[in-house]
């Protein structure tokens, strides 16, 4: 018995059958296949698969494999069967099935398609027209993510200079795994003349918080107390603030990084929901001090992509001295 089993391990199995490919949503590509015909009876079938560039090798018992990928270029999967999980075992002859992007002139497809998730409440995508497109092209953006039952069409198409864009509501769901997923995007034209463009936006990247709102500035001795409202929707471990203080007399420009800080000093309006406070030391009260604040997401929560919020409105305190 043992010998037979051993033989079935080294024996090359027949290839899988009926390998087919389909697309779900906008960018979920799914391959399915049937077990090989005439496989060894004492073989516990496993399937070896990898994409055309030998990437993402996988050995698994399932007769399906899926990938979330922007369908801007051809993608192929090769599948073989074997009798163990051992990667060094030679699988059967590999069967390949490819899927090509929708047809069309590549020069007609939109370029620089990118999206930013604003304050975890709406997503704004923008793109440039392709080189081979007429100026009166009417674009449509479609999007899908896990919490939607079907593909949605974005209604708010706009134009900003050379760029076209569209924004749609996308609110962070309490479900802790929500941000581990992605939004699938496709842009095409109403007339079907341009080649569709796809993008996948991970919800852990391209997050831009709203700017903070400065509520109050006050002096106590030589310290400047700053109180501001935090942007909504974020948890405190995911944000930090940059407080910039400019002094008109000394022309100094001080920058402080600040963690969300409780308003515990008597100088602050206390127990106000969603506010943070910071004390800037050694500020001259008899000069004009101008403060502005911006906020950034923490790399441990959202991937680092250098996206700060816009600056808050400036607020000033103190007196501008005469130049005499």
């Amino acid at each position: 018995d043992y010998k037979d089993d051993d033989e079935s391990r080294t024996e090359t199995q027949p290839p899988v059958t009926n390998l087919s490919v389909s697309v779900e949503n906008l960018c979920t590509v799914i391959w399915t296949w049937n077990p090989p015909e005439g496989a060894s009876s004492n073989c516990s079938l496993w399937y070896f698969s990898h994409f055309g560039d030998k990437q993402d090798k996988k050995i698994a018992p399932e007769t399906r494999r899926s990938i979330e990928v922007p369908l801007n270029e051809r993608i192929c999967l090769q599948v073989g069967s074997q009798c163990s999980t051992n990667e060094s075992e030679k699988p059967s002859i590999l069967v390949e099935k490819c899927i090509s992007p929708p047809e069309g002139d590549p020069e007609s497809a939109v370029t620089e398609l990118q999206c930013i998730w604003h304050n975890l409440s709406y997503m704004k995508c923008s793109w440039l027209p392709g080189r081979n497109t007429s100026p009166d092209t009417n674009y449509t953006l479609y999007y899908w993510h896990r919490s939607l039952e079907k593909i949605h069409q974005c209604e708010n198409i706009f134009r900003e200079g050379q760029y076209f864009g569209c924004s749609f509501d996308l609110t962070k769901v309490k479900d802790s795994s929500f941000e581990q997923h992605s939004v699938q995007i496709m842009v095409k034209d109403n007339a079907g003349k341009i080649k569709p463009s796809f993008n996948i936006v991970p919800l852990t990247s391209r997050v831009k918080p709203d700017p903070p709102h400065i509520k109050n500035l006050s002096f106590h001795n030589d310290d400047l107390y700053v109180q501001w409202e935090n942007p909504q929707n974020f948890i405190s471990r995911c944000l930090f603030y940059e407080v910039e203080v400019n002094n008109s007399q000394t022309e100094t420009h001080n920058v402080f990084y600040v963690q969300e800080a409780k308003c515990e000093n008597p100088e602050f309006e206390r127990n106000v929901e969603n506010t943070s406070c910071f004390m800037v030391p050694g500020v001259l009260p008899d000069t004009l001090n101008t403060v502005r604040i911006r906020v950034k997401t923490n790399k441990l929560c959202y991937e680092d992509d250098k996206l700060w919020s816009n600056w808050s409105q400036e607020m000033s305190i103190g007196k501008k001295r005469n130049s005499t």
Partner: antibody
């Protein structure tokens, strides 16, 4: 004054378990991440992982994932680093440090020397 | 995974001289996350610079940081005897291998 005070030096045998501690004071312990950094004898600094005591959310460096466990007890403002089965290669100085959201370690503990030898 | 490479490995200088330490990232990083530390023998590291250019509390102004993208620099304008130590750059989960500043 912000302070992080670590537990004392440990001498252990391979295969033994160990839990070292880091007590924070002088700031809101639940509002800042606490990180652990390893320094093997004569070598550089290695980022092991961090914990946010406010909700015990942890992140590990891939090199240390599954090798150690980071935990915290916010009621006593203390973070922990533990091993279930020590190896000789775990011999090192371990530092805890406060880790603000902008990702630098701004206050450090004095270090805990862990020696693993048969 | 980002790799930080520090150069030179050792810098031999005299007190009063200017020290320039380099930290190069394998890919572009946000300067918000770049920090510099000083470590003396038998001591814990000490934060000098965060956000690539902001001095930490209590750090003398002879220490300054600059740079963006992939190239960052720590400058000590005039070396004091207490500045001879090992210096590390760091970006979140990654530390550079260190530069030792020793007395010539």
């Amino acid at each position: 004054e912000v302070q992080l005070v670590q537990s004392g030096a440990e001498v252990k045998k391979p295969g033994e378990s160990l839990k070292i501690s880091c007590k924070g004071s002088g700031y809101s312990f639940t509002s800042y991440w606490i990180g652990w950094v390893r320094q093997m004898p004569g070598k550089g600094l290695e980022w092991m992982g961090v914990i946010y005591p406010g909700d015990s959310y942890t992140r590990y460096s891939p090199s240390f994932q599954g090798q150690v466990t980071i935990s915290a007890d916010k009621s006593i403002s203390t973070a922990y680093l533990q091993w279930s089965s020590l190896k000789a290669s775990d011999t090192a100085m371990y530092y805890c440090a406060r880790f603000p959201n902008w990702g630098s370690f701004d206050y450090w503990g004095q270090g805990t020397l862990v020696t693993v030898s048969s | 995974e980002i790799v930080l490479t520090q150069s030179p490995g050792t810098l031999s200088l005299s007190p009063g001289e200017r020290a320039t330490l380099s930290c190069r990232a394998s890919q572009s990083i946000s300067s918000s996350y770049l920090a510099w530390y000083q470590q003396k023998p038998g001591q814990a590291p000490r934060l000098l610079i965060y956000g690539a250019s902001s001095r930490a509390t209590g750090i003398p102004d002879r220490f300054s940081g600059s740079g963006s993208g992939t190239d960052f620099t720590l400058t000590i304008s005039r070396l004091e005897p207490e500045d001879f130590a090992v210096y590390y750059c760091q970006q979140y989960e990654t530390f550079g291998q260190g530069t030792k500043v020793e007395i010539k």
